[in-house]
């Protein structure tokens, strides 16, 4: 699995996506959770509605929160007010059984600032960017807002 | 075993420049968040700067940010610090540190022997 | 910036006695905190880690307290090898940021 680098600002949310194909994972719950080291577990954080079918609905665990488009296929991970303690490897998972596929591997880092970004000096806005290895950056921030553009909505 | 050792440090006339690295070995050095500690003489401990894992996020001390610049080679299990326009209070022995938490930060538990920077005319 | 202000500055005890070192937050800090030991020549030694966690390594004797703002080191029987100078440092909120330091030297 690539590993997709999500990036956010401490003290403000970050959401974190994750596709699959909905048709394959019809009718399992997903959840999200946190490695703590290169062997050890996966550690669950949070997971959708016991029933399936009201994936959608909001689950929270602390500041933590999912909800699953079943039909088109996103898992969604709000971090709300990160914190620097948030950043680490972290897996979206496709549940079955006592099993569990890995959707994708998510790098979260937390930055102390907007301008503590490796390119301090462009603008930059959610989106791909720069490789680790094998994976790639998502942006989950922006850096300063040209005139006539249009903010991005407020997270509480 | 699990090692830092620095490197680079020297004297230097204000205004002038100097590259530290610091060579890690005895774990995946691209599983951690890497970072520089200096100690002026007779004084604390103080952050310079750190590095994610994948280099891409970063974090300097005011003190230093503008004139520092911080990066990791994964491939060389390396880690470095540019200073530029150095001055006296940037005299210390800065020391390389291994960030505690997989993929993520937390207390340095593991530190190299540290490198010497003197900024004197 | 979150302060940390660490006490006593210095702390003359003999082997054997008990020692009992303070860091107070400016603000809270959870459990977010570490504490290291220096000696004179040597880097820093991570004793302890989310306030109450010894460190691969670390004897027993050194146990770490506290939550929020008021977190206390305990070393319960100090040896020779302890004499040291102590730091704190939190890592709750950018800037993370050391205490002064205490110095625990022998009376």
């Known amino acids: 699995h690539n590993t997709t680098v999500f990036q956010g600002v401490a003290g403000q949310s970050l959401q974190v996506s994750c596709p699959y194909d909905s048709m394959k994972h019809w009718g399992r719950r997903k959840a999200w959770c946190r490695q703590l080291g290169e062997k050890g577990p996966c550690q669950r954080v949070v997971s959708t509605h016991n029933l399936w079918l009201l994936s959608f609905l909001r689950r929270w665990n602390g500041s933590t929160a999912i909800t699953d488009d079943t039909l088109g296929g996103t898992l969604t991970i709000t971090l709300r007010n990160l914190q620097p303690h948030d950043a680490g490897l972290y897996q979206c998972q496709s549940l079955h059984g006592s099993e569990a596929d890995t959707l994708r591997k998510v790098l979260v880092e937390v930055l102390a600032d907007p301008l503590d970004h490796r390119d301090a000096g462009d603008l930059w806005f959610p989106g791909e960017s720069e490789s680790f290895e094998d994976a790639h950056v998502e942006h989950s921030i922006s850096r300063s807002l040209l005139e006539g553009e249009i903010p991005f909505p407020p997270t509480s | 075993q699990v090692q830092l050792v620095e490197s680079g440090g020297g004297l230097v006339k204000p205004g002038g420049s100097l590259r530290l690295s610091c060579a890690a070995s005895?774990?995946?050095?691209?599983?951690?968040?890497m970072s520089w500690i200096r100690q002026a003489p007779g004084k604390g401990l103080e952050w310079v700067s750190y590095?994610?894992?994948?280099?891409?996020?970063?974090y300097y001390a005011d003190s230093v940010k503008g004139r520092f610049t911080i990066s990791r080679d994964n491939a060389k299990n390396s880690l470095y610090l540019q200073m530029n326009s150095l001055r006296a209070e940037d005299t210390a022995v800065y020391y390389c540190?291994?960030?505690?938490?997989?993929?993520?930060?937390?207390?340095?538990?593991?530190w190299g022997q540290g490198t010497t920077v003197t900024v004197s005319s | 910036e979150i302060v940390l202000t660490q006490s006593p500055a210095t702390l003359s005890l003999s082997p054997g006695e008990r020692a009992t070192l303070s860091c107070r937050a400016s603000?809270?800090?959870?459990?977010?905190l570490a504490w290291y030991q220096q000696k004179p020549g040597q880097a820093p030694r991570l004793l302890i880690y989310?306030?109450?966690n010894r460190a691969t390594g670390i004897p027993a004797r050194f146990s770490g307290s506290g939550s929020g703002t008021d977190f206390t080191l305990t070393i319960s029987s100090l040896e020779p090898e302890d004499f040291a100078v102590y730091y704190c440092?939190?890592?709750?909120?950018?800037?993370?940021?050391f205490g002064g330091g205490t110095k625990v030297e022998i009376k």
């Open positions: 603000q809270s800090v959870s459990s977010y």
């Open positions: 540190a291994r960030l505690g938490g997989y993929y993520s930060l937390g207390p340095m538990d593991v």
């Open positions: 005895g774990f995946t050095f691209s599983d951690y968040y």
């Open positions: 989310d306030a109450s």
């Open positions: 440092q939190q890592d709750s909120a950018f800037p993370f940021t």
């Open positions: 590095i994610s894992s994948s280099g891409s996020t970063i």
